[in-house]
Structures are given as C-alpha cells and as structure tokens.
C-alpha cells in the first residue's frame, strides 16, 4: 500500500494549527470498516492518534489532534495538530493498513518570529570620539535559534568583538542577546539583524551615535527613538532612563507613566514606594534598577488595544519627560490557497484563486505573483477583517485565465515584523483537479 506524505517538513508557527498531510489510494469498494490508521511519533513510537474498527479512536496526544473524518474514505489520512508547541517538533509516522500495509513519516518544523530588536547603549551619555561603548541588541520569543549579524551604516559586516547568547524559556522559545563593543568615531550607525533561518525573517534595529556633551539643566529622560515592537501575548519593556546625581535617593523620585493621548495613569512610583499598576494589573517597574536611573516599564501579555504612545515623567528636583511608542504585532499564518472551480481545469478556463491568512496584526500587505516572480495586479480583491482581539484575517482573491500551465503565489506581508508568509498553487496544462488527487 502506497502512503504519501510531503517530502519537505511542514513548517508551523507556535500557537497555530498544523496539518500533517498523509494520503493513500483506496481501492474500489473500500469501506472505513477495513481501515486501520495510526499516527505515532517516529522516534519514541508514542501513539498520537488512531482510527480502527470503523471509528476515530481519538487523540492520545494532549487532546490536540484530529483527523478529517469526512475525507478518510477518499484516502485522506491527514492529521490536524492544534496549538503547536516547540515540543511538537519532530517526525510523525502515518501507518495505514487495509488489506496491505504502508507507512511514511512527515517532519514538523516549528517556528516563531523574532521580535524587532531593542538596542541599548552602555555608557549612554557624555560620549566622545574614542570612547568604547557596548551596544546590546535583544530580540525575543523566536524559534529556532536565530542568526545574528551586525553591520555599519554602509552595510559592512561587523564581526569583531561580538558576543551572542541565546536562552530558551519554558516554552522553548529563544531570547537572543547580542553585544557589540565598538570604539566611537565622529559618528556612526550600527545595525543589528536577527534572522530566523526557518521563516527567512529578518528583524532589524539601528542606532546612530553622534558623540557630544549632554546638555545640563532639566532632568534628561531618555527613551528609544524607534517604536517598541511587541508580539501579541508577549511581554514588552518600554525603556526609560534618567541620570541620577550623586547622593540621589528613591525618596526624592516621582515617576509617572501615563498614556500620552488620554493622560490615563498607567503606573507610578512616589514617596519612595511603588504605587502599583493602574492599567489592568499588567504593568511593573524594575524596582532594583530604579536607583540607577532605570525607569522602564514592563507591560505583560500585550494586546492590540495597548498600541500607542506612553509617556515617562521623571521628577527629582528638576523635571523631565519623554514618550515612547508601542507598536503591537502578530505574525500572519501561512496562507491557505483554494481554487474555484477546482476540477477538470483546462487552458482558457477562468479560475478564482483565494488566499487566506489569519490572526495577524497590523493589516497585511498582499501581493500576487507568477512563477517568474512577475507581479499580478489585475483582478485582485483583498479584504481584511478584525476579530474581537483586533487581529486581522486576510482574504485575497485573484481571477486568472489559465495558460498552458502556471504557478500563482500569494505573499502576505506583515509590514511591522517584516514577515513574509506565502502560499503557491501550480496549475498544469492537462485537465486536472485541485488539490491533486493522491
């Protein structure tokens, strides 16, 4: 019995659902009562899901798997794995037994996009040409391990004096911290590129350093110039710092975080005490670092509604403030492609190809192209609809007249994460059915 699975690994984003395709060719007169189907982990032989005695025996894998019961009779033995985790990565074997027996293994490659890197400088004031500074680039919650590259303003790679560390959290997602030590010239731009090798996603940030004397006077409050980009559901740090003078004590400090536009109080520290979160109990300061001038705010379990500008007010004897922007993002799922009509297609037929990608933020950019990468701009209709959490589902429809054969690709781009998700369909010249029959 020939059992067919994809040659390439199935790539699934953490938290999304994945389909492990498996198919066989049922003979005439085949009934489900004859079918024994077992999915198991290839290495450990742990049972994942099974179908026997004409019945779905259910999930043996954390209740996160399902078959496609309506499609089994046509030979579709695919497995749906829900809410993918890093720990799911690996090989799954599909065993099919009717009268004969066959099996094949499919690989699941788990991935998660890295956040836009945040950059910090140490020291971060009174910088002069010739000073050595440490630039730290941090990017969070990605998988698998990242590749980190540094370059200057001309794009020239910076490979000396770089130390990169990657640490996995309890979910197996990596936080990457890369440190570049440089001696300052008259001025310079330093860029950190964090690449997810599986998603082929590049996240980058830059810092331009112009050494000069800091002005004296009011409290100088420093925040990042670029928006802080945070993935929905993760934690974000809104960085804010000031320079305490000698003899400074926390009893002198008044720190207030508020929403810039509405002036809604978010968090405060006054009278030597943390007054706590006034923002849905999802904020925290870094109490151990306040005395060193670190007034940063931690925002937990970021939601789309959190997007916007936050102002950090610092008052000691003098007063200063600065606003930092929070840009919320969520990666789009790999697009699914459907054809209408999807049977007996011939050159000259008009077909409607629909590309759907889910639960991203902000709104996506959608591009269509042919097999040569030539953009297809005519007869495209794209709609985007936000759900209750503010995440967008995108549906793009392309109408084309079939040539002898052709590949049509849909690219869904998250402009903030610089994440490209794509799906393709290849239509051949002969009369055909989509999806191709096993």
């Amino acid at each position: 019995l020939e059992v067919q699975v994809p040659e390439d690994p199935v790539v699934a984003l953490v938290g999304t659902d994945a389909t492990l395709c498996c198919s066989f060719s049922p003979e005439p007169g085949f009934s489900l009562a004859q079918l024994n189907l077992i999915w198991q982990l290839t290495d450990t032989k742990q049972l994942v899901h099974s179908f026997a005695e004409g019945q779905d025996q259910g999930s043996a894998y954390a209740n996160r798997t399902a078959l496609f019961p309506d499609l089994l009779a046509q030979g579709n033995a695919s497995l749906r794995l829900q809410r993918v985790r890093v720990a799911d990565e690996g090989s799954f074997t599909c065993f099919v037994s009717i009268r004969d027996f066959g099996s094949a293994a499919v690989s699941l490659q788990v991935a998660a996009p890295y956040s836009k890197p945040s950059m910090t400088l140490e020291p971060n004031k009174d910088l002069r040409p010739g000073d050595t500074v440490t630039i730290t680039c941090s990017s969070y919650q990605g998988y698998p391990e990242a590749e980190v590259f540094w370059q200057d303003g001309q794009g020239v790679p910076l490979t000396g004096n770089v130390t990169t560390s990657q640490m996995a959290n309890e979910q197996g997602l990596f936080d990457v911290h890369s440190i570049l030590r440089v001696v300052l010239g008259a001025n310079g731009t330093y860029s950190c590129l964090v690449r997810n090798p599986v998603l082929q996603q590049d996240a980058h940030s830059s810092v331009t350093i112009t050494p000069q004397r800091s002005p004296t006077g009011a409290v100088e409050v420093q925040v990042p110039e670029d928006p802080v980009v945070a993935l929905v559901g993760t934690d974000a740090t809104l960085r804010c710092s000031f320079s305490p003078e000698p003899g400074f004590s926390l009893a002198q400090l008044n720190l207030i975080w508020q929403l810039t536009d509405t002036k809604q109080l978010v968090h405060s520290f006054t009278e030597g005490r943390d007054q706590g979160s006034a923002y849905a109990n999802r904020t925290a300061l870094f109490p151990d670092l306040l005395a060193q001038g670190n007034a940063s705010l931690r925002l937990q379990r970021v939601r789309v509604a959190d997007e916007g500008s936050f102002t950090c007010f610092v008052s000691i004897r003098d007063f200063g403030s600065a606003a930092v922007s929070l840009q919320v993002a969520a990666p789009y799922s790999k697009p699914s492609m459907t054809l209408e009509p999807n049977k007996d297609l011939r050159p000259g037929d008009t077909v409607t190809i629909t590309c759907s990608s889910y639960r991203g933020y902000p709104e996506a950019e959608v591009f269509w192209q042919d097999g040569q990468g030539v953009p297809l701009t005519g007869n495209v209709t794209t709609s985007q609809m936000a759900n209750e959490q503010g995440l967008f589902d995108v549906h793009s429809v392309l109408r084309v007249v079939l040539g002898a054969n052709g590949t049509y690709s849909c690219l869904v781009r998250n402009p903030v994460l610089q994440q490209d998700a794509h799906g393709s369909v290849t239509i051949t010249g002969q009369p055909m059915t989509f999806p191709p029959e096993a």
């Epitope: 590259f149 303003g153 001309q154 794009g155 020239v156 490979t159 590129l193 590049d202 980058h204 610089q418």
Partner: antibody
C-alpha cells in the same frame, strides 16, 4: 523601473585621473547604498567599495584605498567614482551596483550599471 | 580576507545533462550569493542567501551549502545556461567574488 546609467568609455593617459558617473532612476537614491566593482578583461570581479548616499559614509577595499574615491550628488541622484594615478593595470570595465537591501541579509547586487570601459594607454 | 575558490574554472555540458559547480571559502561564511554573466553584459543576480533563486531564474537551478562549501546545480542543462557563474560573499569585509566557472554548451 530601476536604472543605473553609467558614463561612456574613457581613453586616458597613464598618470591621469578619471571620474566615472552612475546616474540612477526609478528608486529613492538615499535609501540604498551604491557599490563599485572592477572587472579586468577576461577576469573576475573585484569589489572596490561602497558609499551610503544618505550621509556620504564610505568603506573601501584596502586594495583600492588611495586609488578610488567615491562621492554622490543627491540632487541629481548620481554616484561618482574618481580613479587617480592611472596605470595600464587600471584598464578594465567598472560597474556601479545597487544591493537588494541595506537592512536585510539580501546582500546580492540586484541592479547593475551597463559598465564603463576604461583604457589607460599612452 | 576571505578567498573564494571556484571549481572547475571551465566546464562543458550537453543539453539535458546535470551540472554542478562549487565554491569553496577560505573561512566560514554565513551565506553565498551567485551571479550569471554572459559576454558583453553586466552580471545578473542568480541565487541569493545560498539557496533562493533570484526573480526570473529557471527552477532547474538550485543552490546549497554551508560553512566553507557551497554549490550551484543545474538539473538539466539548456543552451541558454552557457555563461560564467560567480560566487560572492559579504559575511566578512571586504566583499569578495570567486574567479568564476565558465560553463559551455557541448
């Protein structure tokens, strides 16, 4: 459509200098760096250096320091390369080339000028 | 600087034949890039980030490799593939090219 239009062929005497231009169109000049590449007759490609039109920052291949000077004119979206103290070894085709992206790992040159042929001869 | 050594320097292939050329780096590089150049023309980007085909490149081309060893493969040679192919790296400064592999039609 992105285009890099280089100046025409040059025949110069040894010891002289020459300035080759690369006029760009079809994209925002300051958003991409510009590289220069040398190809001697029947030979491989050699990287000369790169300039960031946004701030004029340059990086040169050590081999071409003192030989080549890269400049830009933002108002006309044109990049220039001046070659000085010319010898017969400098006879070659010189290309300007734009990389796909500055802030991604796409470090390939996806647009090239048509090349400027320089002949150094007495 | 990182030296890229391409081999063979010259090769010929018949239509339909499988072709493989290599590019060896003197030190490890993160990614390799390939260009195709035909006589009296500028180089064209062919493969980027080791294995991705540039726009318009036929699917019979593929790229692979890691570390110090990279290759470009044509699954089935066609007449239009006759050209010189150069590899390039910029993982380390200065940017360098290989000496090229000239592919001729047999």
């Amino acid at each position: 459509e992105v285009q890099l239009q280089q100046s025409g062929p040059e025949l110069v005497k040894p010891g002289a200098s020459v300035k080759i231009s690369c006029k760009t169109s079809g994209y925002t000049f300051t958003e991409y760096t510009m590289h220069w590449v040398k190809q001697s007759h029947g030979k491989s490609l050699e990287w000369i250096g790169v300039i960031n039109p946004n701030n004029g920052g340059t990086t040169y291949n050590q081999k071409f320091k003192g030989k080549a000077t890269l400049t830009v004119d933002k108002s006309s979206s044109t990049a220039y390369m001046e070659l000085r103290s010319l010898t017969s070894e400098d006879s070659a085709v010189y290309y300007c080339a734009r990389p796909h992206s500055l802030l991604r790992l796409r470090r390939e040159f996806d647009y090239w000028g048509q090349g400027t042929t320089l002949t150094v001869s007495s | 600087q990182i030296v890229l050594t391409q081999s063979p320097a010259l090769m010929s292939a018949s239509p339909g034949e499988k072709v493989t050329m290599t590019c060896s780096a003197s030190s490890s590089v993160s990614y390799m890039y390939w260009y195709q150049q035909k006589p009296r023309s500028s180089p064209k980007p062919w493969i980027y980030l080791t294995s991705n085909l540039a726009s318009g490149v036929p699917a019979r081309f593929s790229g692979s490799g890691s570390g110090t060893s990279y290759s470009l493969t044509i699954s089935s040679m066609e007449a239009e593939d006759a050209a010189t192919y150069y590899c390039q790296q910029w993982s380390s400064n200065p940017l360098t090219f290989g000496a090229g592999t000239k592919l001729e039609l047999k």
